[in-house]
Amino acid sequence: MKVLQEPACVSDYMSISTCEWKMGGPTNCSAELRLLYQLVFQSSETHTCVPENNGGVGCVCHLLMDDVVSMDNYTLDLWAGQQLLWKGSFKPSEHVKPRAPGNLTVHTNVSDTVLLTWSNPYPPDNYLYNDLTYAVNIWSENDPAYSRIHNVTYLKPTLRIPASTLKSGISYRARVRAWAQHYNTTWSEWSPSTKWYNSYREPFEQR
């Protein structure tokens, strides 16, 4: 049994780090492998993560952690029974992938404006809470040529779009993702998309 692609891990900077790797051949990850992790810290214990399959030769493990601080460093050992396949380390603060924003809602009852709101995925006491900026993707299923990214660089998780910039009488979808500039993170996954119908019509005298 051999590791083809070494584990690569990202942290949500809250409570979970996700490690993915590829094996040399088809593997029943949960039955054959264990990923052991231990915080380099006084009296810390070794904890065990049971991986899941992620494709034929891929494995993924979700490491449960306490809150993350910048000093944290973990040792990682990938075992197949009594055989040590790989040994490494992981500093969560240097490999951050934020959680995806949630509760994306479209408000169309605001005159002339489409208002999108969503929730910050972190509690106020988390370091990332005040550091997230967002990208909102809006596209149309009726008009494949239409797809826009709106960068939200302010803290408030809202976006206002003039309804007049969207075609009337067709459906649109939106999704949002986040990143944290000062933590040099990757982008989060996209939130689930939400759909709305743009029924806005310009006033007669503006036509």
Partner: antibody, heavy 125, light 112 residues
């Protein structure tokens, strides 16, 4: 009531051995790291050894490394300190203390918040 | 290894007056924001040590609020706002960031 009770101290000749015990009660013993601290007559406090809740992680002061062995029996809620090759400078009151909660991924520290009454070890010929 | 240095080593105080003990470490004891791995202990004559302050500024259960801990990194202070007769004994700081744990030499607080 959270309590630690030491036993096993006594008079021993240089080169001899003693085994100290520390019985814990009133808390989930296996979840906490434990520590031994000693105090020579008229001197300050000196850390001796620590052990994590599972017993997998063990730490010693240089002054006792290779001579003392810390261990625990979580089924008996008891901490031990096996003292071999005793020297005159090991003469002290030995205290056990409840250390950090080590069952969490990052051990949670609340100080050495419970101490035993101490047991006296005298090494003399 | 981390070394802890306390001062003063002797502290005569009049009851009702404040008292302050300093402790300095040779390495930073700050692990994360607000968490300095330094404790303060009091050992009264003939007794086991008792925890006063943990993680730099957290009072242990049952400790009177006249005791407070402050400082960060390498410099720490234990303050007693109004000393009482029952506060006499030896005060020790201790670093608990990593083994070997290290205690200060101890400060003897006595009533004038």
């Amino acid at each position: 009531e959270v309590q630690l009770v030491e036993s096993g101290g006594g008079l021993e000749q240089p080169g001899g051995s003693l085994r100290l015990s520390c019985a814990g009660s009133g808390f989930t013993f296996r979840d906490f790291a434990m520590t031994w601290v000693r105090q020579a007559p008229g001197k300050g406090l000196e850390w001796v050894s620590s052990i994590s809740g599972s017993g997998d992680n063990i730490y010693y002061a240089d002054s006792v490394k290779g001579r003392f062995t810390i261990s625990r029996d979580n089924s008996k809620n008891t901490l031990y300190l096996q003292m071999n090759s005793l020297r005159a400078e090991d003469t002290a009151v030995y205290y056990c203390a409840k250390d950090r909660l080590s069952v969490t991924v990052r051990p949670r520290y609340y100080g050495l918040d419970v101490w035993g009454q101490g047991t006296t070890v005298t090494v003399s010929s | 290894d981390i070394v802890m240095t306390q001062s003063p080593l002797s502290l005569p105080v009049t009851p009702g007056e404040p008292a302050s003990i300093s402790c300095r470490s040779t390495q930073s004891l700050l692990y994360s924001i607000g968490k300095n791995y330094v404790d303060w202990y009091l050992q009264k004559s003939g007794q086991s040590p008792q925890l006063l302050i943990y993680l730099g500024n957290n009072r242990a259960t049952g400790v009177p609020d006249r005791f407070s801990g402050s400082g960060s990194g390498t410099d720490f202070t234990l303050k007693i706002s109004r000393v009482e007769a029952e506060d006499v004994g030896f005060y020790y700081c201790m670093q608990a960031l990593t083994t070997p744990y290290a205690f200060g030499q101890g400060t003897k607080l006595e009533i004038k």
